[in-house]
Amino acid sequence: GIAIPRNSGCPNSEDKNFPRTVMVNLNIHNRNTSTNPKRSSDYYNRSTSPWNLHRNEDPERYPSVIWEAKCRHLGCVKADGNVDYHMNSVPIQQEILVLRREPRHCPNSFRLEKILVSVGCTCVTPIVHHVA
Amino acid sequence: GIAIPRNSGCPNSEDKNFPRTVMVNLNIHNRNTSTNPKRSSDYYNRSTSPWNLHRNEDPERYPSVIWEAKCRHLGCVKADGNVDYHMNSVPIQQEILVLRREPRHCPNSFRLEKILVSVGCTCVTPIVHHVA
């Protein structure tokens, strides 16, 4: 059935589009109250599973620029600076929402899209498969 | 100035709103071709900086459910299972886009919002401040 707006001040929606196409205000509200909430800009170097950041730009996407993590080593860095290959550096991935211009190049029409991004790396104990 | 649509098939936009309010198709396109793209569902247990996942639900937000990581220890887990407090477990955080219903309770009107989420944890060497 067609949803009944719960608030009389809501924008109207045509039945054929509803609820697939919505109006979105791009004036981003930032919920991060702290002035410097992340404090993680140097973790990529200090981690036992360090990573490099790669720039991915797509003007048809919002956000256009995403920095992706790529683990530097297969193993993990020990206290002496050497790599321990008995452990594994693995990417921590997250599915995020982005807006994709649709039709292409349109400044004011988008479609929601889910993409998988690597945010950083962590050091894990490998899964050992024992052969009988 | 008012942007000229780059594609004659673009929806119109009123000057007063443009380019802040846009049309978004909520029919999500998933760019992740793999059936199990994350492959990181057990990293939270196997990591030397393990984390727990906490469910955060907000019906006024899209997506309404977000899982947040909380590091289990201040230190990092050694091979023998004990915690090494000379190292630090730290959250890897990422700013992500969500849609916030605006006005509240409206089914088809949203505002973009940036929120900071903890995706997982990594083990880092601490910054030591030497006192003169």
Epitope: K38, S41, D58, P59, P63, W67 | -
Partner: antibody, heavy 121, light 107 residues
């Protein structure tokens, strides 16, 4: 008001290094990357690289062969460009410019005033 | 690297003239281009972004068009303050490259 204010002119010897600063104000520093562009006397514009103050990510024009280092200090909203092993052909005006991570359509909308670097023995 | 070739490299025109500057990419894998105006001793100023769109505060006599490898900046009626050097910049392929510039002089 958005402003990018760069450090003053520098005169350097060949083989030395120079570090140019770019102090941002009037916007959220971490929402924008800082790109660096240079212009030799009477020449065109040359893109040098980009730094993301939020993640610490950097990407360089390989033409500079590892001589460029871009950094940022989030606490002071200041970006830095260091160029090492200077040679006479590095004599140029160096510009910083902000670039929105959210919308490429808002790229390079504000520029610093430029810093003249002269390399001479 | 993608080369951006601007033509002409310089041109003379009079106030009121219609002027067109073109920018050609060495390959077609760019996403869009920006146009900048630069006056002597000043930083570049963005005129057109995303190939077509007028930057804030830029007069409507400036317009941009193009796709693929060929792009154009048009000034419909030259004004005295428009005499400057113009640069295109490609976005979408690293490194982001600028054209060599077109110097617009008073005839």
């Amino acid at each position: 008001e958005v402003q990018l204010v760069q450090s003053g002119a520098e005169v350097k010897k060949p083989g030395s290094s120079v570090k140019v600063s770019c102090k941002a104000s009037g916007y959220t520093f971490t929402d924008y990357e800082i790109h660096w562009v240079r212009q030799a006397p009477g020449q065109g514009l040359e893109w040098m690289g980009v730094n993301d103050p939020e993640s610490g990510g950097t990407f360089y024009n390989q033409k500079f062969d590892g001589r460029v280092t871009l950094t940022a200090d989030e606490s002071t909203s200041t970006a830095y460009m260091e160029l090492s092993s200077l040679r006479s052909e590095d004599t140029a005006v160096y510009y910083c410019t902000r670039y929105s991570k959210w919308d490429s359509f808002d790229g390079m909308d504000y520029w610093g005033q430029g810093t003249t670097v002269t390399v001479s023995s | 690297d993608i080369q951006m070739t601007q033509s002409p490299s310089s041109l003379s025109a009079s106030v009121g003239d219609r002027v067109t500057i073109t920018c050609r990419a060495s390959s077609g894998i760019i996403s869009y281009i920006d146009w900048f105006q630069q006056k002597p001793g000043k930083a570049p100023k963005r005129l057109i972004y995303a190939t077509f769109d007028l930057a804030s505060g830029v007069p409507s006599r400036f317009s941009g068009s193009g796709s693929g490898t060929d792009y154009t900046l048009t000034i419909s009626s030259l004004q005295p303050e428009d005499f400057a050097t113009y640069y295109c910049r490609q976005v979408g392929s690293y490194p982001e490259t600028f054209g060599q510039g077109t110097k617009l002089e008073i005839k």
